[in-house]
C-alpha cells in the first residue's frame, strides 16, 4: 500500500522537515527559516511559535518541531501548551480581575496559582479542628472530640466573620 | 468531555426535604468548585451556594443557611444538595454548574441540565 | 450587599437590528470583578455567551460583544446584528466576593 501511494504521490517520500513543493515539480525542499514540518508528507510547512513579551522560549523551534514556550518569572502557564500566562500571586491570595486579592474568611491557597478554596470540614470525618486554617494553610483535623483524653481539648475555630455565605464547621 | 447530569424531576410535599444529584464527568472532579443555583418560574437565577468537592469545605448563601446542605462522594465524582423544610417558594429548576479556577470571579463553564422540584401540598 | 441592575428588563427587536443590554452595578466598583454573560433559552441551562467582561467562547458568533464603562459602572453586552437563534434571555454575572455570585435579573430579547 506504501508503495502504491508512493507512486500516485510523490509528495509522500517528503520527510519532515520539508514541504513538498508544487513550483518545483513536487521536488521536497527544505522548510525555510523559523518554519517546520513535524510529519512527512507535508504540503506546507508551519510558521514557528514564537515566543514574545511574557512568554520566553524553553525550546527552540527546529525544522521538524514547533517552539516550545514557557512564561517569564512572576508569571505561570495556563492552558495545552502554554497558551496563556498568568500572573503569580502569593499564598493566600487568589488572582481575580483586579489582580491579587486576599483569600476570604474560610478559604485559603497554599499556592502561588489557582483559586483559594475551602478549609476542610472536619465534621464531616467526625473529627475536630486541631489547628485553625489560614489564608494560606487548610485546618488541621485532630481527633473527635470524643476520642480526646480527659483534660485534653481541642481548638475551636474562630467565629466565621460576615463573610457572605460562608458556613462555620 | 466534560459532563454534568444531574438527577430527574421531583414533586415534594411542605416540610419534606428533596435531594438532588450532580454526577460529573470528563474532568478532576476533585480540583473544581461545584456552585448551585436555582430558578424559580420566570424568575432569574439565585445563587445557592458551592462546594469544594476536594475537601467538602461549603459555603451556603444566607437565605439557605440551615436549609441547604452539600455533600460530594469522590469515589462516584457525584455532587448532592439537599434542601430541607421545603415550601411552595422552593418550587424551581435548581443547576449545578462548574467554575474554571483561572480566577477568582471566574465564569460558570459547564452547567447541569436542570432539575425540576415542585413543592405542591 | 452588591446588586447588578439589567435594563431593559425586556425588549422587542427587529432581525439585523443591533441590539445592547446593560448590566448595572449598584455599589462598588464594575472593574473590581469580571462580568460574564449567559444566554438562557426556554427549558434549557444557561449557555455562556461573554466570559471576564469581553472574550466569546469558542463556538459563540462574533457579532456578541462585551464592554465595560467606569464612569457609569455598567457593563454591556451587544449583538450587532439579531439573529432568529439569539431570542432568548440574557442574564448577567459578577461577584459580590469571590465566594458569592450575583446575577443580574435578566434581559427578555423578543421578536417585533
Known amino acids: 500500500f506504501e508503495r502504491t501511494r508512493s507512486l500516485q504521490d510523490p509528495c509522500s517520500n517528503c520527510p519532515a522537515g520539508t514541504f513538498c513543493d508544487n513550483n518545483r515539480n513536487q521536488i521536497c525542499s527544505p522548510c525555510p527559516p523559523n518554519s517546520f514540518s513535524s510529519a512527512g508528507g507535508q504540503r506546507t510547512c508551519d510558521i514557528c511559535r514564537q515566543c514574545k513579551g511574557v512568554f520566553r522560549t524553553r525550546k527552540e523551534c527546529s525544522s521538524t518541531s514547533n517552539a516550545e514556550c514557557d512564561c517569564t518569572p512572576g508569571f505561570h502557564c495556563l492552558g495545552a501548551g502554554c497558551s496563556m500566562c498568568e500572573q503569580d500571586c502569593k499564598q493566600g491570595q487568589e488572582l481575580t480581575k483586579k489582580g491579587c486579592k486576599d483569600c476570604c474568611f474560610g478559604t485559603f491557597n497554599d499556592q502561588k496559582r489557582g483559586i483559594c478554596r475551602p478549609w476542610t470540614n472536619c465534621s464531616l470525618d467526625g473529627k475536630s479542628v486541631l489547628v485553625n486554617g489560614t489564608k494560606e494553610r487548610d485546618v488541621v483535623c485532630g481527633p473527635s472530640p470524643a476520642d480526646l483524653s480527659p483534660g485534653a481539648s481541642s481548638v475551636t475555630p474562630p467565629a466565621p466573620a460576615r463573610e457572605p455565605g460562608h458556613s462555620p464547621q | 468531555e466534560v459532563q454534568l447530569v444531574q438527577s430527574g424531576a421531583e414533586v415534594k410535599k411542605p416540610g419534606s426535604s428533596v435531594k438532588v444529584s450532580c454526577k460529573a464527568s470528563?474532568?478532576?472532579?476533585?480540583?473544581?468548585?461545584i456552585y448551585w443555583v436555582r430558578q424559580a418560574p420566570g424568575q432569574g437565577l439565585e445563587w445557592i451556594g458551592n462546594i469544594w468537592p476536594g475537601n467538602g469545605g461549603t459555603f451556603y448563601g444566607e437565605k439557605f443557611m440551615g436549609r441547604a446542605t452539600f455533600t460530594a462522594d469522590t469515589s462516584t465524582s457525584t455532587a448532592y444538595m439537599e434542601l430541607s423544610s421545603l415550601r411552595s417558594e422552593d418550587t424551581a429548576v435548581y443547576y449545578c454548574?462548574?467554575?474554571?479556577?483561572?480566577?477568582?470571579?471566574?465564569?460558570?463553564?459547564?452547567w447541569g441540565q436542570g432539575t425540576l422540584v415542585t413543592v405542591s401540598s | 450587599d452588591v446588586q447588578l441592575t439589567q435594563s431593559p428588563s425586556s425588549l422587542s427587536a427587529s432581525v439585523g437590528d443591533r441590539v445592547t443590554i446593560t448590566c448595572k452595578l449598584n455599589s462598588g466598583n464594575i472593574g473590581s470583578y469580571y462580568v460574564h454573560w449567559y444566554q438562557q433559552k426556554p427549558g434549557k441551562a444557561p449557555k455562556t455567551m461573554i466570559y471576564r467582561d469581553d472574550k466569546r467562547p469558542d463556538g459563540v458568533p462574533s457579532r456578541f460583544s462585551g464592554s465595560g464603562d467606569s464612569s457609569s459602572n455598567s457593563a454591556f453586552l451587544t449583538i450587532s446584528s439579531l439573529q432568529p437563534e439569539d431570542f432568548a434571555t440574557y442574564y448577567c454575572?459578577?461577584?459580590?466576593?469571590?465566594?458569592?455570585?450575583?446575577f443580574g435579573q435578566g434581559t427578555k430579547v423578543e421578536i417585533k
Open positions: 454548574a462548574r467554575r474554571p479556577d483561572y480566577s477568582g470571579d471566574d465564569y460558570f463553564d459547564y
Open positions: 470528563g474532568y478532576t472532579f476533585t480540583s473544581y468548585y
Open positions: 454575572h459578577s461577584y459580590d466576593s469571590t465566594i458569592t455570585p450575583v
